[in-house]
Interface confidence: low
């Protein structure tokens, strides 16, 4: 807390300018009018104030706006944003994408801080959904943003926003998140032709069901092993050897290197050894010839 002291004669600030960088903290407190500061916030970011001086300026704004800053001030906070606490930000009503961009720019190159997370949360809640422009902006600054959302939050993403998603934005998504995103992606890209569709949908396939993988196997897509290894195990298990061969195309040879890892390992255990041998890869662990395979899950469903 800065003590209240009278402003020395001749030091009263007429405007926010570079002369203030030489003011001590108590002088800033005493000589800078909060209302003047609020109207000239755009200058604060450009003037090279120290963090200590910014603390004083923040204190003045807090006194002027105890219920939270107006957006006209928020948009020009610049480096002062780094001084805000999540509690401060929860008082704000940020509706402009330009304001959001301006504040994200200040934090650019750093991890997502609690302040930024709170800001984004306030903004998205205010908008009601993650529209394409917002998602575009957020993933540009934070590629991992999408995967930081819960499946429930992701359900508010409209399919049209999926066009803004890049493959790297999904790198840290888990299967539950891809389960939500995949149907949206399928809807978003439904009017594309086969090869273009596969390029776009590929990153989302960790949420694809068996029937969609079967359909893709009929389209000569040549899925790479990295994508195959991210597929849901329960979606891969029902695929036949022929379907996996068609799905992977020339990449099928990579199965040998992955035979001890899921989902390949579990898939091998479900295939007839005879069928696996037709691949000529030396995959072992299939069902020996002459054994009868009972699908107990089907039996339970019927009883």
């Amino acid at each position: 807390e800065v003590e209240k002291t009278a402003c020395p004669s001749g030091k009263k600030a007429r405007e926010i300018d570079e002369s203030l960088i030489f003011y001590k903290k108590w002088e800033l407190e005493a000589c800078v009018d909060a209302a003047l500061l609020a109207t000239q916030m755009d200058r604060v970011n450009a003037i090279p104030f120290t963090y200590e001086q910014l603390d004083v300026l923040k204190h003045k704004l807090d006194e002027l706006y105890p219920q939270g800053y107006p957006e006209s001030v928020i948009q020009h906070l610049g480096y002062l944003f780094l001084k805000m606490s999540p509690e401060d930000i929860r008082k704000w009503n940020v509706t402009s994408l330009e304001t959001l961009k301006a504040l994200l720019e200040v934090n650019k190159g750093h991890e997502m801080s609690p302040q930024v997370a709170t800001l984004i949360d306030r903004f998205v809640k205010g908008r009601g959904q993650l529209d394409k422009d917002t998602l575009d902006t957020l993933t540009a600054f934070y590629p991992g943003y999408l995967c930081s959302l819960s499946p429930e939050e992701l359900s508010s993403v409209p399919p049209s926003s999926i066009w803004a998603v890049r493959p790297q934005d999904l790198d840290t998504c888990d299967p539950r998140q891809l389960d939500v995103l995949y149907p949206k992606a399928r809807l978003a890209f439904q009017n594309m032709n086969g090869s273009e569709y596969f390029v776009k949908i590929q990153s989302f396939l960790g949420g694809a069901p068996t029937e969609d993988l079967k359909a893709l196997s009929q389209q000569n897509v040549s899925m790479d092993l990295a994508t195959f290894m991210k597929l849901r195990t329960d979606a891969v298990l029902p695929l036949t050897v022929a379907e996996v061969q068609k799905l992977l195309g020339p990449h099928v040879e990579g199965l040998k290197a992955e035979e001890r890892h899921r989902p390949v390992r579990d898939w091998i255990l479900r295939q007839r050894q005879d069928d696996l041998d037709t691949l000529g890869l030396g995959l072992q662990g299939g069902i020996p010839n002459g054994y009868l395979v009972l699908d107990l899950s089907m039996q339970e469903a019927l009883s």
Epitope: N45, A46, P48, T50, K108
Partner: nanobody, 118 residues
Framework: EVQLVESGGGLVQPGGSLRLSCAAS????????MGWFRQAPGKGRELVAS????????YYPDSVEGRFTISRDNAKRMVYLQMNSLRAEDTAVYYC???????????WGQGTQVTVSS
Amino acid sequence: EVQLVESGGGLVQPGGSLRLSCAASGFISNFYSMGWFRQAPGKGRELVASINSFDSITYYPDSVEGRFTISRDNAKRMVYLQMNSLRAEDTAVYYCAARLVRQAFNYWGQGTQVTVSS
């Protein structure tokens, strides 16, 4: 240790131009702001330009806006101040200064004299 060495000062006629250079060494980070200050005889030190090395945001006070331009070359660790339309009141010792972002300017050069006179 951070060292700043200015050059380019001298005598120039009103309306003329000068380009000051500042060579920086010993920096451990690009996360620095650089500034040019000046001090006229009997007056306090005045900031005339600053630039962030990481995002190139520049700042000029009204007294030099449009006449002075600060620029940098991160690779060479150089900062420049191009001064055009010089006036008699621009006469001062010009100092190059550096600081970590949002800290006080805590590294200073020795200064270079600029005299504007006919």
